[in-house]
Interface confidence: medium
């Protein structure tokens, strides 16, 4: 979650992550090229609402100030931990060229070659150590280890890093060995659900573009709004069918059959007073999908959800009603009414997949997570285009911790606020080939909305 270059004893003690860009040591944050400068981290200081009522007891409060209070602030369209990259949607040495929008398409509409590129890219990401970032394996006050001299960090693969980010956003606050405090979720149960997962996907998409050397590589989506009792992406051509001899595992004909999961053993980390360190913890599992004759959401559910005009409503939590966000996340029924017995849309899709995908802390281990969230983001984008909300639609305060408009999304680094992602996909350099206004056209003629 932090750049390797900053995770030194000095960096941690000084709480400063302002690396030089290139070999010139004085080119801090690309300052000599006018790209950025080292600056105090701005954090949201407005009050949040329950259920997290503690103060100064969690690493993620005032993110990322428990770790770094000075980072690179990039100018213009420059971005990255050393201002060496461009903001999403921009390219060129000076980041002043609008990148042609990439197109996220239905996974079923990909050609065999495109499909292979996507699946191969995921597999490559699973096997490639992240070149720039490391994960922390201890909580903030134990970050320098028992002797106070050794940053507690670990390398992990690009895909496992993607998983770790999600785990870290939902893990418990740990008050002591074996005593978790379960009251916090920085990426679900509040308005940040949509922006957090949007940034999460953009991050992965950019990593896959780097890995494949293809700047126009786009994540596909899985239109899970079929109303069916089957997972039509759980095939060996796509994300792996069930194994004949053990249906909870993935068929040996799929490259995903050998994928091992990380960050699954929450209770174990709480007991051992540690964080997920990227150790493999067993094979990816999908228990019987659609158990109890459960059915996936329908297109009608999507349309009902899109007809809700309010982005979110107090208390901006899982019990908000007539809230587009809460209906999309799936705590409300699709029409915005609350029924605590019912799961819908995004939540229902996760639950339907069962296994690894049904638990928030481990869900991202399953590559179905990527295409499921890509479709969820497509629905969010359709809502943005239809409603063109002002930033005032997002609560400035009294959302749960992490969900206020100006809160830096945990644990992304360098810091990025919810507000910065409350834009249409087009403004962020991508689009969806999807029409959510009626029955989606057959895959060979999928249209842009």
């Amino acid at each position: 979650q932090f750049p390797r270059v900053c995770m030194t004893l000095d960096g941690v003690l000084n709480k400063e992550c302002c690396p030089p860009l290139g070999p010139e040591a004085t080119n801090i944050c690309g300052f000599l090229e006018g790209r950025g400068q080292c600056a105090e981290v701005q954090t949201d200081t407005r009050p949040w609402s329950g259920p997290y009522i503690l103060r100064n007891q969690d690493d993620r409060e005032q993110w990322p100030r428990k770790f770094f209070n000075r980072t690179c602030k990039c100018t213009g369209n420059f971005a990255g931990y050393n201002c060496g990259g461009c903001k999403f949607g921009w390219t060129g040495p000076d980041c002043n060229r609008k990148k042609p929008a990439i197109l996220r398409r239905n996974i079923h509409s990909l050609t065999a070659q495109e499909r292979e590129q996507f699946l191969g890219a995921l597999d490559l990401a699973k096997k490639s150590i992240h070149p720039d970032y490391v994960i922390t394996t201890q909580h903030w006050l134990g970050l320098l280890g028992p002797n106070g001299t050794q940053p507690q960090i670990a390398n992990c693969s690009v895909y496992d890093f993607f998983v770790w980010l999600h785990y870290y956003s939902v893990r418990d606050t740990l008050l002591g060995p074996g005593r978790p405090y379960k009251a916090i979720d920085f990426s679900h149960q509040g308005p940040a659900f949509v922006t957090w997962h949007r940034y999460h996907l953009l991050w992965l998409e950019r990593e896959l573009q780097r890995l494949t050397g293809n700047e126009s590589f786009a994540l596909p989506y899985w239109n899970f709004a079929t109303g069916k009792n089957e997972c039509d992406v759980c095939t060996d051509e796509l994300l792996g069918a069930a194994r004949q001899d053990d249906p909870t595992l993935i068929s040996r004909n799929s490259r995903f059959s050998t994928w091992e999961i990380v960050c699954d053993s929450l209770d174990d980390y709480n007991r051992r007073v540690t964080l997920c360190n990227g150790t493999y913890e067993g094979l990816l599992r999908r228990n019987k999908v659609g158990r109890n004759n459960e059915k996936l959401p329908t297109l009608k559910n999507v349309q009902d959800c899109l007809s809700l005009q309010k982005f979110d409503s107090p208390p901006f939590f899982q019990n908000s009603t007539f809230s587009f966000r809460n209906a999309l996340e799936g705590f409300d029924k699709a029409d915005g009414t609350l029924d605590s017995q019912v799961m819908n849309l995004h939540n229902l899709a996760h639950s339907f997949l069962n296994g690894t995908n049904a638990l928030p802390h481990s869900a991202a281990n399953d590559p179905v997570f990527v295409v499921l969230h890509s479709f969820t983001d497509a629905i969010f984008d359709e809502w943005l285009k239809r409603n063109n909300p002002s930033t005032d639609a997002w609560p400035q305060e009294l959302a749960p911790i992490g969900h206020n408009r100006m809160y830096n999304m945990v644990p992304f680094f360098p810091p990025v606020t919810n507000e910065e992602l409350f834009l249409t996909a087009e403004q962020l350099g991508y689009n969806y080939a999807v029409d959510l206004s009626e029955e989606e056209a057959p895959v060979w003629s999928t249209t842009l909305s």
């Epitope: 009522i53 007891q57 006050l141 134990g142 002591g176 005593r179 405090y181 379960k182 007991r271 007073v273």
Partner: antibody, heavy 112, light 107 residues
Framework: QVQLQQSGAELMKPGASVKLSCKAT????????IEWVKQRPGHGLEWIGE????????NYNEKFKGKATFTADTSSNTAYMQLSSLTTEDSAIYYC?????WGQGTLVTVSA | DIQMTQSPASLSVSVGETVTITCRAS??????LAWYQQKQGKSPQLLVY???NLADGVPSRFSGSGSGTQYSLKINSLQSEDFGSYYC?????????FGGGTKLEIK
């Protein structure tokens, strides 16, 4: 594994002060709260308060403010609780705890 | 401060029976509750954390349940080693108060 080792029993005079210690091993001492709990003979458990050794942050039960003071020494992984102006009401077993783990308790007896 | 009301205060039961101890919080504590067992002259031992999760090494005859303000600890098929005192404690904002305790005695 995680262990909390407390100092031995104390026999004190009324009005005196006593400092109890709790040495932690087996985990990163600085990062997690150490709590202090009082138990009078034949009574239940009373939460006195807690300290986060790495930052020195403390939370006290209102009832024990002015009576108990928490400190921690991160170099020896030891937390301390000082009890001042002792009265017979302070005679009790005092436990330190961190999460799921408890010390063996220190018996404090206040007697003239 | 949140008050924890534990009942019953004492209980006399035979080996092999099933018992349930309850704890009521004065406000919603969102499952941030622990149960402890304490034997005479010993430190409390954690049995259950976060209302429903069994701590390491605790036999499966113990189980925790509840949400909101109402919580309970159930012990199936009591064994002789289960006798002692039981306490609940909330972790929903300081002070982390305990229930008054339940003394479980052999009939």
């Amino acid at each position: 594994q995680v262990q909390l080792q407390q100092s031995g029993a104390e026999l004190m005079k009324p009005g005196a002060s006593v400092k109890l210690s709790c040495k932690a091993t087996g985990y990163t001492f600085t990062g997690y709260w150490i709590e202090w709990v009082k138990q009078r003979p034949g009574h239940g458990l009373e939460w006195i308060g807690e300290i986060l050794p790495g930052s020195g942050s403390t939370n006290y039960n209102e009832k024990f403010k002015g009576k108990a003071t928490f400190t921690a020494d991160t170099s020896s992984n030891t937390a301390y609780m000082q009890l001042s102006s002792l009265t017979t009401e302070d005679s009790a077993i005092y436990y330190c705890a961190s999460g799921a783990y408890w010390g063996q308790g220190t018996l404090v007896t206040v007697s003239a | 401060d949140i008050q924890m009301t534990q009942s019953p205060a004492s209980l006399s039961v035979s080996v092999g029976e099933t018992v349930t101890i309850t704890c009521r919080a004065s406000e919603n504590i969102y499952s941030n509750l622990a149960w402890y067992q304490q034997k005479q002259g010993k430190s409390p031992q954690l049995l259950v954390y976060a209302a429903t999760n069994l701590a390491d090494g605790v036999p499966s005859r113990f189980s925790g349940s509840g949400s909101g303000t109402q919580y309970s600890l159930k012990i199936n098929s009591l064994q002789s080693e289960d006798f002692g005192s039981y306490y609940c404690q909330h972790f929903w904002g300081t002070p982390y108060t305990f229930g008054g305790g339940t003394k479980l005695e052999i009939k």
